[in-house]
């Protein structure tokens, strides 16, 4: 067999469009120009080529561009996107806001890919920071993403950003997560009156100290307790009962379908049963009248 | 957006003929290609024919000399006539549109066409 490395005789494409998709794969690698390939990237979205047809043009795009695409091909990707591997996407230096979205617009509805991670990692870290476009645009396709961030990365947010953050965005985050995202939102939203501020800060509030719970219960904010049970263990412990039942206001009868669930069993353990009963729930588990109470963390502090 | 629907699909005898309809409507913009591709049980998608907004038209080899390719570009709608069927044509035919000016492409629910020996 003749081998078949040559462009027919009248099949060298002057454009890229769709009578290319009838060409065998060695008649592309052999007729289609990469040049022309690169300044029509915008085309290649719009023709139904085989996944065997896009390996053919992503090898000539990598033949042409051995250092990594420029941006005005990565723009125009569409869903050759998909055949990229994070090592490929690690040579490329995206700045564009329009670029990054047009890459997730690809991927929409679809799990976080490792190309799409490695793509907002290199996107991010070009920014040198998690400014709120940024933000606003990774979590409207990926409301799990700011969970998906270590707290070290976490912390070159800028509070400013907390402002694009949904509360669904922040339904995966774990503790150690909400403790580095609480004191910006903190920040964030400082201007704002009493009601307002609780309705921002609320789903936050896993990473909040006493001391801010404490200030809360004194607002009339009437915590419900599915945020009261994500609060912080230690932040609730030293709460007393006057505090939890101010926090709380009309949902502090809630408390009895918790009690065996931290951090409210946790904190019963804490209270005086005295002070347990004024709550009229029938809280059990509290410290006997008559108990002297060691704060043995305290005693350690002192020596 | 573009909606696409297929018709024209069904039984046939071997030698015969059929003729296969895609109307398009929503935003349709040149420039633009309109393209017939068929699938048959356990096979990869083929293209089988197309035709731009030029009118330029283009075959798979497969079916070179027996399919023709035409567009009514004034009711957006591609024809596909069919002569000289036969058993390995049996597939499902789909039809796609390319939007070059968006860089999008669009595409049908397919009709069936089954040819008999």
């Known amino acids: 067999e003749v081998e078949k490395t040559a462009c027919p005789s009248g099949k060298k494409a002057r454009e890229i469009d769709e009578s290319l998709i009838f060409y065998k794969k060695w008649e592309l690698e052999a007729c289609v120009d990469a040049a022309l390939l690169a300044t029509q990237m915008d085309r290649v979205n719009a023709i139904p080529f085989t996944y065997e047809q896009l390996d053919v043009l992503k090898h000539k795009l990598d033949e042409l561009y051995p250092q990594g695409y420029p941006e005005s091909v990565i723009q125009h990707l569409g869903y050759l996107f998909l055949k990229m591997s994070p090592e490929d996407i690690r040579k490329w230096n995206v700045t564009s806001l329009e670029t990054l979205k047009a890459l997730l617009e690809v991927n929409k509805g679809h799990e976080m890919s490792p190309q799409v991670a490695t793509l907002i990692d290199r996107f991010v870290k070009g920014r040198g920071q998690l400014d709120k476009d940024t933000l606003d645009t990774l979590t409207a396709f990926y409301p799990g993403y700011l969970c998906s961030l270590s707290p070290e990365e976490l912390s070159s947010v800028p509070p400013s950003s907390i402002w694009a953050v949904r509360p669904q965005d922040l339904d995966t985050c774990d503790p150690r997560q909400l403790d580095v995202l609480y004191p910006k939102a903190r920040l964030a939203f400082q201007n704002m009156n009493g009601s307002e501020y609780f309705v921002k800060i609320q789903s936050f509030l896993g990473g909040a100290p006493t001391e801010d719970l404490k200030a809360l219960s004194q607002q009339n904010v009437s915590m419900d307790l599915a945020t009261f049970m994500k609060l912080r263990t230690d932040a609730v412990l030293p709460l007393t009962v006057a505090e939890v039942q101010k926090l709380l206001g009309p949902h502090v009868e809630g408390l009895k379908a918790e009690e065996r669930h931290r951090p409210v069993r946790d904190w019963i353990l804490r209270q005086r049963q005295d002070d347990l009963d004024t709550l009229g729930l029938g809280l059990q588990g509290g410290i006997p009248n008559g108990y002297l109470v060691l704060d043995l963390s305290m005693q350690e502090a002192l020596s | 957006q573009v909606q696409l629907g297929e018709s024209g699909g069904g039984l046939v005898q071997a030698g015969g003929s059929l003729r296969l309809s895609c109307a398009a409507s929503?935003?349709?913009?040149?420039?633009?290609?309109m393209i017939w591709h068929r699938q048959a049980p356990g096979k990869q998608r083929e293209p089988v024919a197309s035709?731009?907004?030029?009118?330029?038209?283009n075959y798979g080899d497969s079916v070179k000399g027996r399919f023709t390719v035409s567009r009514d570009i004034v009711k957006n709608t591609m024809y596909l006539q069919m002569n000289s069927l036969k058993p390995e044509d049996t597939a499902v035919y789909y039809c796609?549109?390319?939007?070059?000016?968006?860089?999008?492409?669009?595409w049908g629910q397919g009709t069936q066409v089954t040819v008999s020996s």
């Open positions: 929503g935003s349709i913009f040149s420039p633009n290609a």
């Open positions: 035709i731009n907004s030029s009118g330029s038209t």
């Open positions: 796609s549109y390319s939007d070059f000016r968006r860089g999008t492409q669009y």
